[in-house]
Amino acid sequence: IWELKKDVYVVELDWYPDAPGEMVVLTCDTPEEDGITWTLDQSSEVLGSGKTLTIQVKEFGDAGQYTCHKGGEVLSHSLLLLHKKEDGIWSTDILKDQKEPKNKTFLRCEAKNYSGRFTCWWLTTISTDLTFSVKSSRGSSDPQGVTCGAATLSAERVRGDNKEYEYSVECQEDSACPAAEESLPIEVMVDAVHKLKYENYTSSFFIRDIIKPDPPKNLQLKPLKNSRQVEVSWEYPDTWSTPHSYFSLTFCVQVQGKSKREKKDRVFTDKTSATVICRKNASISVRAQDRYYSSSWSEWASVPCS
Amino acid sequence: RNLPVATPDPGMFPCLHHSQNLLRAVSNMLQKARQTLEFYPCTSEEIDHEDITKDKTSTVEACLPLELTKNESCLNSRETSFITNGSCLASRKTSFMMALCLSSIYEDLKMYQVEFKTMNAKLLMDPKRQIFLDQNMLAVIDELMQALNFNSETVPQKSSLEEPDFYKTKIKLCILLHAFRIRAVTIDRVMSYLNAS
């Protein structure tokens, strides 16, 4: 058993049918010695008396808010949560496996630049009685500071018969140098509590591996005289690290017809302009990627050919 | 990225072209190592990230773009002295900091070159003959060093009398390649920045 926060405790259980469970001793936080009784949740049934209560915690029915009283007055509370260990592996019932970029990906994180700011998000089908708490650091043995905000509900989607909820959090490394070469990964830890179930999820990454630039901005077309060709130009996104000559991007320019089946023409360039043939009803899209370290491509910025 | 790329002319700055070749070569070598050594811990998540140049050179600090010198988190400076003549500088007026930067890059390359050559000698003794260092990568390191053209003491190749532990050598190769790729990215950024300025 360990303390998650004041008066909230997590009991770790080896979870299998007929498991013996864990013996837990609760102590009433009071100078009183006599006349103390214990109850669980809203029930008035007295579970025991005395300054300490010994219980065998086996299932969720044994978890909840234990309260010690004296003469009708509440003395203190202890909330017991359960953390299930199923055949050596902690349960992952609360969050959805996003399966990207690999199986067992519960937390996904992205950064728009090298400033040390990043966003993480996760999915769940649970709509109520759910709380999250996020902590982060650079490295784990001698951790350096990363400050995270509160997790917020950022999107709701309908998936088949189920509703899916997306939560996200923004974090900022306290003293980040955009040019630094990372040798210790960022660690992100999310505590999730659903009713009386506790779970924790972690992700470990280097900022350089989660970079996804914003799409190029100010995408414009300039027709070339007496030609079907156009000059496409764009700019680095505002959110990208500066100076741009140091944090350089490379670009992919795509000409896509109305039909998805039509052949796509693609050009790769390090410049912020390109000359392409603009077909009728086609659109031109440009996306960006770090020129030197191949992390994710940005989303596409698009303009119609007409 | 095995894709058609419209690359800009490296122009006045001869080192830019060599640094781009270096990044390409080390990335290819790392990819080959990850595929060949699939049963070894060779991914970024599995290895310890070690920097053999730590406390010996200070490339990131010495090559910091002017715009980032206002960022206190970037000024984690370490006192290091360097030799300051190099042919990449020949065509332009240059500051002491730029010379310091390029000589730091040169020292990095020299250190990695020694490590890779020592390691290759061990890998050649492996009866499995599983993996060797790409000669192209070693050649590219050499070319960039020549383009930087700093006078520097030659570091003798380390020789070892004991029987090499091939498992450890292959894991060390992965660690070195990961670190060298990160340094090659920094070198490329620096060369691009210097070329633009």
Partner: antibody, heavy 115, light 112 residues
């Protein structure tokens, strides 16, 4: 005390369907994940499928994906395996099993796919 | 498609020490715990070892398990006639959990 009693096995022609059941007693069935495991005659153990305690997630071996469906009825304390498009290579003893460090197995039920 | 490899058979005379190996990789045994099962002819498998080296109550102490790196082993110290059976190791793969990964199985024969 924990008991898993299996039923539903038998002889079936290739391409036909069969549903296996596993009735649980002696524990809170709705709190635990469950597996199906099979063993072809004279061969080793092969995992078939898994279902979460609440039925929210299901996982299958590649060899049965798209043909077999694992399900559970927590109100009846019963686990099911619906098997469609059966093949000769599905011939095996099928076991249900609880998920956890200490597990309990059903007695097994024989499924024979033969023309 | 077994990823955990066991020797097909091992044998010993009563009282001898018999060991069965189970060889895997970094993503399975290297990252997860190992179980061992005993299966007597015509019966369901019986759990012998869980969490690499733990014995459930009721399992004789002549059975012991161990794990090192990407391999595990089961030892029967002082093998007895009633130990003649098939033995299977089981683990998970970190990418496909909760799918069970079973070993290829080992037939233990007690001679004489």
């Amino acid at each position: 005390q924990v008991q898993l009693v299996q039923s539903g096995g038998g002889v079936v022609q290739p391409g036909r369907s069969l549903r296996l059941s596993c009735a649980a007693s002696g524990f809170t069935f709705s709190s635990y994940g469950m597996h199906w495991v099979r063993q072809a005659p004279g061969k080793g153990l092969e995992w078939v499928a898994f279902i979460r305690y609440d039925g929210s997630n299901k996982y299958y071996a590649d060899s049965v994906k798209g043909r077999f469906t694992i399900s559970r009825d927590n109100s009846k304390n019963t686990l099911y395996l619906q098997m469609k498009s059966l093949r000769a290579e599905d011939t095996a003893v099928y076991y249900c099993k609880t998920h956890g460090s200490h597990d309990n197995w059903g007695q097994g039920t024989m499924v024979t796919v033969s023309s | 498609s077994y990823v955990l490899t066991q020797p097909p058979s091992v044998s010993g005379t009563p009282g001898q020490r018999v060991t069965i190996s189970c060889s895997g990789g970094r993503s399975n045994i290297g990252s997860n715990t190992v179980k061992w099962y005993q299966q007597l002819p015509g019966t369901a498998p019986k759990l012998l070892i869980y969490y690499n080296d733990q014995r459930p109550s009721g399992v004789p102490d002549r059975f012991s398990g161990s794990k090192s790196g990407t391999s595990a082993s089961l030892a029967i110290t002082g093998v007895q006639a009633e130990d003649e059976a098939d033995y299977y190791c089981q683990s998970y793969d970190r990418g496909t959990h909760p799918a069970l990964l079973f070993g290829t199985g080992t037939k233990v024969t007690v001679l004489g």
